[in-house]
Each structure stands twice: as structure tokens, then as C-alpha cells.
């Protein structure tokens, strides 16, 4: 996240982290039941590590994680390697979590966000896009969904009904390593973070999640034949 | 079957240019990262350029800064090198190279350059 | 930019021996490293890429490990068609930089 704040400790309880070997963040990702996490389908690798209840980016140990298997991917069958469009992928974890104050699954948005509607996304990725700057815990940042329209102008020919555009001033946006992560705007999981321009934060390049309303069914019909 | 297929290569004076293209094919070109490497003869690789898949975002090694020139052509899957002011230390084979990165997706993680083409030869010299 | 150091620069061996090459980067770059073979008058070709991970088709007797500033290909038992000179590559960062390369000649 660049140019975010400190998230408030504990107040992103679905907030999860992929981890490839025994600490190195490569994804975020979101709780939205007792054993199953949403991710960007461009994160699947074939073995990695899940942490949820953690607000440091270092391997300290803390009160509130707990840690996990992922034992199913499932991405999206319309998703497609190293296109944005379908960019979910289901994981069923290793056993349900105990549900704390730091972990507690979000609901997902039925509807689909609006233009001018505020929203938090947050992650542990870079918060410059030289690729050497982590933050030291969870960051948080406000940002506006924004019309199809300028959607497609910032990136033509390249959104389709399966992304929305958000952001804020340039200088504000999602970065490497936050991938997967949640975009909840009224306390419901409106997107995932996909992609964006590089460098991140450039004016009229605003990041692109993934529009969660258009997927509702087969998150939930997947979820229940798995 | 997946390919690059370089070209433009030959003779030049030093201070004289040449426009390298490179064609791909086997895969949709437009969305993948694309870069230009070049080998000294007898020498290692040396990373030229790279150019994001939708071009909006370019580098260049500080060797060739000011003088080299990449650029791409989805609707053609092509990928260019305009090179200018050549001087004799910029003879080499030159290389364009698939990048499996996708600097647009916001995941952290690398990967490197998973197709190559054969190469094509620039002398520069008087 | 980041300096990429390998070593050692040419190593002469047998068929069958365990080969053991080195990368170290000037600062570090946690995992994101990428190791390609080059035949004589050919293209590279991507070996490995994420310090450990074998790219589809390359054989299960090349391996690569480490983190941070340190990392090593190791060829677990050399065959015929493996003598040729390996560069390592560091990605996260640009200007993307390349090891002055590893020659592997037959002994």
C-alpha cells in the first residue's frame, strides 16, 4: 500500500497473508468463512502458507494469529495466466479457524459497488514500487470506487464487468504484494486487489480489483460442492 | 509453438543507427513484458530494456540511456529497439526475451525470462 | 543498481560429478533470482527462477537454493548436454543485472 496509514490492530480480522517457505509474504488475501479464503487467482502456487490474526510484517510471534494449510485452490475456471479478467481463486484451509477478535470472516457484497463509494483496502506489499520498501505492520487505505468510464479511459481495452476501478489522489494506491487483499467498502468485501499500473500510484492509473459482485454464485456454489 | 524472431541487425558506422524488431508468435503478445538483452562477442549477458505489456512503463540500462529507444506494437506483436549515436562497444548480439513478470499484477513475486530469440547481430564499426 | 557476482568463473568436470555454482548479489534480494543455461552460438534458457523453483522441462537434476544475498545451482550429477556457461540474474529490481557468468567444461 503506498502512502497508507497503520491499520488499527485487530480491525481487519479477515486480512490474511500467503506466505511462500517460512515467511515470505507474496499475497494477501480475505477470510469469508470459517475455513475457506478468497485470493487473486494470479496468486495460486503449487505450495504456501497461510497466516491470519497478524498485524506485524515480521514472523513475530503474536497473540491472535493462527496459521494454516491451504489443502484446495480453486481458481476461477475463467481466469487465465497472465490475464486480470476472473482474477479469484477459492482456498479451503487445513481446518476452520477459532473465531477471535482477530480473526473473524467478512460477508461479501450481493451488489455491486457504486461510483463514489468509499472503501478500505489494505495489505502488507510495498509501499514504493522500487520493490525494497515493506511496511512494518498492516496498512490501510481509504479509497473511491470510481466510474466504469474513467475505469476504461485509464486502461483502454483492458477492464471488462469482472474489475472495478478504485483510488484516490495520486500518490494513494495498492502495490506489489497486495494482491488478493481486501477492498471492503460498508463493512461488505466489495474486491480483491488484481493489478494496476506500474510504478503503483500514478496519476490516472488507479489500481483494478476484482468485482466480487458478479461472483457471489459461484463463490457460494463452490464452496458448498467442495 | 511459442517463438521471437529477431531482426534488423548488420554494419553500422559508429554514430550511425539501427532499428532492431523483433516478431512474436504462439502466444498473445500483448499480455506479456518484453525486454532486449545483448552479448559482447566473448562476453556475459548484459540486460538492455524493458517495456511493461501495455508499454506503459520502460527502462534502460545506463550504458544505452538517451541513445536506445524501445517500443511495441500489439495489434502487430512486435517489439522494437531504435538504437542511436551506436558506438563500437554497442556491438553484440541482441536478444529479445519473453518476461514472465507481470509488473502489472500487484503480487510479490519474480520470476525471469522464459523465451528468447535466436539473436541478431550488430557491428558497429568504421 | 544491484552487482551480481558468480563463482567461480569456469569449473572443469566429469560426467556424473555434482556441480556447484554460486551467485551473490550486493544487496539483498530475497528470493527473486533467476539462473539460465547458454549453449555455445544459442539463445539462454530460463533454468530456474525464484532461486529454487525448476521451470517446466528442465531436469530434476538441477537445483537451486538460497535467500537474501546468497545462492547456489547445483547440478546434482552432470550429463553430456549439460556443458555450457550458466548466469544468474537478479529480477526484482531494475535495471535488471546479470553474473559475469560459469563456464562448465568437460574435464
Known amino acids: 500500500i503506498v502512502n497508507g496509514s497503520d491499520c488499527q490492530k485487530d480491525a481487519q480480522p479477515w486480512q490474511g497473508a500467503l506466505l511462500l517457505g517460512p515467511n515470505k509474504l507474496y499475497c494477501g488475501a480475505v477470510l469469508i468463512s470459517p475455513q475457506w479464503l478468497l485470493t487473486a487467482a494470479h496468486c495460486r502456487k503449487p505450495v504456501f502458507r497461510i497466516r491470519l490474526g497478524h498485524h506485524s510484517m515480521s514472523p513475530v510471534y503474536e497473540s491472535g494469529q493462527q496459521m494454516f494449510q491451504g489443502i484446495k485452490s480453486i481458481p476461477h475456471p475463467g481466469y487465465s495466466h497472465p490475464g486480470h479478467s476472473n482474477d479469484l481463486m477459492l482456498i479451503k484451509m487445513n481446518r476452520k479457524i477459532r473465531d477471535s477478535h482477530s480473526v473473524k470472516p467478512v460477508e461479501i457484497a450481493c451488489d455491486c459497488a457504486t461510483e463514489g463509494t468509499r472503501c478500505m483496502v489494505s495489505g502488507w506489499g510495498t509501499t514504493s514500487s522500487s520493490h525494497n520498501n515493506f511496511p512494518k505492520v498492516l496498512q490501510c487505505l481509504n479509497i473511491t470506487v470510481l466510474s466504469e468510464e474513467r475505469c476504461k479511459n485509464s486502461y483502454p481495452g483492458q477492464i471488462d464487468k469482472t474489475m472495478f476501478c478504485a483510488g484516490d489522489e495520486e500518490g494513494r494506491d495498492s502495490c506489489q504484494g497486495d494482491s488478493g487483499g481486501p477492498v471492503v467498502c460498508n463493512g461488505k468485501l466489495q474486491g480483491l486487489v488484481s493489478w494496476g499500473d506500474f510504478p503503483c500510484a500514478q496519476r490516472n492509473r488507479p489500481g483494478v480489483y476484482t468485482n466480487l459482485c458478479e461472483f457471489v454464485k459461484w463463490i457460494k456454489d463452490t464452496m458448498n460442492s467442495n | 509453438e511459442v517463438q521471437l524472431v529477431e531482426s534488423g541487425g548488420g554494419l553500422v558506422q559508429p554514430g550511425g543507427s539501427l532499428r532492431l524488431s523483433c516478431a512474436a508468435s504462439?502466444?498473445?503478445?500483448?499480455?506479456?513484458?518484453m525486454n532486449w538483452v545483448r552479448q559482447a562477442p566473448g562476453k556475459g549477458l548484459e540486460w538492455v530494456s524493458y517495456?511493461?505489456?501495455?508499454?506503459?512503463?520502460?527502462d534502460y540500462a545506463d550504458s544505452v540511456k538517451g541513445r536506445f529507444t524501445i517500443s511495441r506494437d500489439n495489434a502487430k506483436n512486435s517489439l522494437y529497439l531504435q538504437m542511436n549515436s551506436l558506438r563500437a562497444e554497442d556491438t553484440a548480439v541482441y536478444y529479445c526475451a519473453r518476461d514472465l513478470t507481470s509488473m502489472q499484477s500487484r503480487d510479490y513475486y519474480y520470476y525471469g525470462m522464459d523465451v528468447w530469440g535466436q539473436g541478431t547481430t550488430v557491428t558497429v564499426s568504421s | 543498481d544491484i552487482q551480481m557476482t558468480q563463482s567461480p568463473s569456469s569449473v572443469s568436470a566429469s560426467v556424473g560429478d555434482r556441480v556447484t555454482i554460486t551467485c551473490r548479489a550486493s544487496?539483498?534480494?530475497?528470493?527473486?533470482l533467476a539462473w539460465y543455461q547458454q549453449k555455445p552460438g544459442k539463445a539462454p534458457k530460463l533454468l530456474i527462477y525464484a532461486a529454487s523453483s525448476l521451470q517446466s522441462g528442465v531436469p530434476s537434476r538441477f537445483s537451486g537454493s538460497g535467500s537474501g544475498t546468497d545462492f547456489t545451482l547445483t547440478i546434482s550429477s552432470l550429463q553430456p548436454e549439460d556443458f555450457a556457461t550458466y548466469y544468474c540474474?537478479?529480477?526484482?529490481?531494475?535495471?535488471?543485472?546479470f553474473g559475469g557468468g560459469t563456464k562448465v567444461e568437460i574435464k
Open positions: 544487496q539483498g534480494i530475497s528470493s527473486w
Open positions: 540474474q537478479q529480477v526484482p529490481i531494475f535495471p535488471y543485472t
Open positions: 517495456i511493461s505489456s501495455s508499454s506503459s512503463f520502460i
Open positions: 504462439g502466444f498473445t503478445f500483448g499480455s506479456y513484458a
